[in-house]
């Protein structure tokens, strides 16, 4: 049993025992492993119900995965003196169902935050901004990983989950410096239209494995730094002209569209024309039609306008019952 202050080269990570001594600025909390050399603390799969209070001041990378935290209150990481070095915080798979406003306040160097695999029934609009001001102090966050944070249906609030997440992303315009945002596997049916406008620095956006049917009301126009846009494994049927033009206008972007149920009818003509000339779409020759049945498995790039027909809609007077 020893604290991080008595670290030895033969044991870079030291598990601590509960101690009667007062907390020291560089001691290792109970049920955690610490490496001062690596500036890392790991409290992993220990069924912790709250964030340890006695985290060492040197901590730069903090892993709190696989616990039972349930609620992350305001100031969950606020310490005196503050954890000024903490840059990467991983809380994935810790059974969080509530993240309150100001949960990540007083972490001036926090660049990467991973809340994945927590069933967040409640995510405060001020979880990342820390205040309810219309314009808050900029968050230091550069990478925000929110994969599979959708709660089970019976735990959802009345408001839409998409709306709740969007509110947290845009509050106070705090995340203007965000470069990476992962929102995969969240059952999103739509993307609230204002979200991307508030995240102008995004370089990597992962919306894969959701249930997005359309991007008609989503604007990518101001994401001029975007390099990767992941839309695989959604329910996209077609991309319309407005979306195509916006994507084409982004100077560095690569778009991933695999495993969507493309509907190859007359509405697909513009997208097919665009696919044939764009360099934006990765693996574009692997995009295939899912509907109608007669077109299933056809490669989009190999379609021509004659292939893309729509059944005529008869006027009511000509329809038979």
């Amino acid at each position: 049993t020893s604290s991080a202050s008595s670290s030895s080269s033969s044991a870079p990570f030291l598990a601590s025992a509960a101690s009667a001594q007062p907390p020291l600025p560089d001691q290792c909390p109970a049920l955690c492993e610490c490496s001062e050399a690596a500036r890392t603390v790991k409290c992993v799969n220990r069924n912790l119900t709250e964030v340890p209070t006695d985290l060492p001041l040197y901590v730069r990378n903090l892993f709190l995965t696989g616990n039972q935290l349930a609620v992350l209150p305001a100031g969950a990481f606020a310490r005196r003196p503050p954890l000024a070095e903490l840059a990467a915080l991983n809380l994935s798979g810790s059974r969080l169902d509530e993240v309150r406003g100001g949960a990540f306040e007083h972490l001036p160097s926090l660049r990467q935050l991973d809340l994945s695999h927590n069933p967040l029934a409640y995510l405060s609009p001020f979880a990342f901004s820390g205040s309810n001001a219309s314009i808050s102090a900029p968050s230091p966050l550069v990478e925000l990983i929110l994969n599979h944070i959708v709660p089970p249906d019976d735990k959802r609030q009345n408001r839409s989950f998409e709306g709740m997440v969007a509110a947290a992303l845009v509050a106070g315009r705090a995340l203007q410096g965000l470069h990476l945002l992962e929102l995969a596997s969240n059952h999103f049916l739509y993307l609230p239209r204002d979200v991307l406008a508030q995240l102008p620095s995004l370089r990597y956006l992962d919306l894969s494995n959701n249930s997005l049917v359309s991007l008609t009301y989503v604007s990518f126009r101001n994401l001029t730094h975007l390099e990767s846009l992941h839309l695989e494994d959604n329910a996209l049927k077609v991309l319309h002209n407005g979306t195509l033009a916006e994507l084409q206008g982004l100077p560095h972007v690569r778009v991933f569209l695999d495993n969507n149920p493309w509907v190859c009818d007359c509405h697909m003509a513009d997208m097919v024309t665009w696919l044939k000339q764009t360099g934006v779409v990765q693996g574009k020759d692997r995009l295939t039609c899912a509907f109608p049945e007669k077109m299933r498995n056809r490669v989009l790039l190999e379609l021509n306008s004659a292939d893309l027909d729509c059944d005529p809609i008869l006027p009511p007077s000509l329809q038979t019952s």
Epitope: N209, D233, N259, D285, R286, T288, A290, R296, N297, R298, V299, L301, E302, L303
Partner: antibody, heavy 116, light 107 residues
Framework: QVQLQQSGGELMKPGASVKLSCKAT????????IEWVKQRPGHGLEWIGE????????NYNEKFKGKATFTADTSSNTVYMQLSSLTTEDSAIYYC?????????WGQGSTLTVSS | DIQMTQTTSSLSASLGDRVTISCSAS??????LNWYQQKPDGTVKLLIY???SLHSGVPSRFSGSGSGTDYSLTISNLEPEDIATYYC?????????FGGGTKLEIK
């Protein structure tokens, strides 16, 4: 109707190469991927890779890179798979299938026997 | 690579029985799963695509279900011509991978 007709059985010596063929009829040949699948005696199915005939685009299972090479002849609606440096492990039935999100039509299979 | 596992390698049932064949993936595959039938003469046919869609010409006694990592094929009323080996296959990520197969025999 869609049909995939594969070449007949082959008996080859170790170290040799062989080229199996798969002729497609009944659909727009360039509009669909063609898949190749291996089945060793008493074993299951193993995906080798795929080719998009109109473009020559290919994807290979890492395990078969350097072993299998796909080509296509759009004038005869035929896809070929060449297997090189044959060993007894290559003895199997090889199927071609029309692909994409699923393999909806299959050839009858070509049996390759490698023996000294 | 995604591993596909069919835990039952052979299955014996009587004509008219309801038979269920299961298949599990080593990671979530988003319902991107197909089922194939291979007859004793080597002929292979697609039965079910995208977990539950019946391929044209396939009898309605065949059905598929599942999500995430666990999937199944059900034959509701076993007929003599259903004697075959059944394979699941994922197409969520390259390389495509097949299960080891379940051989169905008549009691």
């Amino acid at each position: 109707q869609v049909q995939l007709q594969q070449s007949g059985g082959e008996l080859m010596k170790p170290g040799a190469s062989v080229k199996l063929s798969c002729k497609a009829t009944g659909y727009k040949f360039t509009g669909y991927w063609i898949e190749w699948v291996k089945q060793r005696p008493g074993h299951g199915l193993e995906w080798i890779g795929e080719i998009l005939p109109g473009r020559g685009s290919t994807n290979y299972n890492e395990k078969f890179k350097g072993k299998a090479t796909f080509t296509a002849d759009t004038s005869s609606n035929t896809v070929y798979m060449q297997l090189s440096s044959l060993t007894t492990e290559d003895s199997a039935i090889y199927y071609c299938a029309r692909g994409g999100r699923d393999f909806d039509f299959w050839g009858q299979g070509s049996t390759l026997t490698v023996s000294s | 690579d995604i591993q596909m596992t069919q835990t039952t390698s052979s299955l014996s049932a009587s004509l008219g029985d309801r038979v269920t064949i299961s298949c599990s993936a080593s990671q979530g595959i988003n319902s991107n799963l197909n089922w194939y039938q291979q007859k004793p003469d080597g002929t292979v046919k697609l039965l079910i695509y995208y977990t539950s869609s019946l391929h044209s010409g396939v009898p309605s006694r065949f059905s598929g279900s599942g999500s995430g990592t666990d999937y199944s094929l059900t034959i509701s009323n076993l007929e003599p011509e259903d004697i075959a080996t059944y394979y699941c296959q994922q197409y969520n990520k390259l390389p495509y991978t097949f299960g080891g197969g379940t051989k169905l025999e008549i009691k």
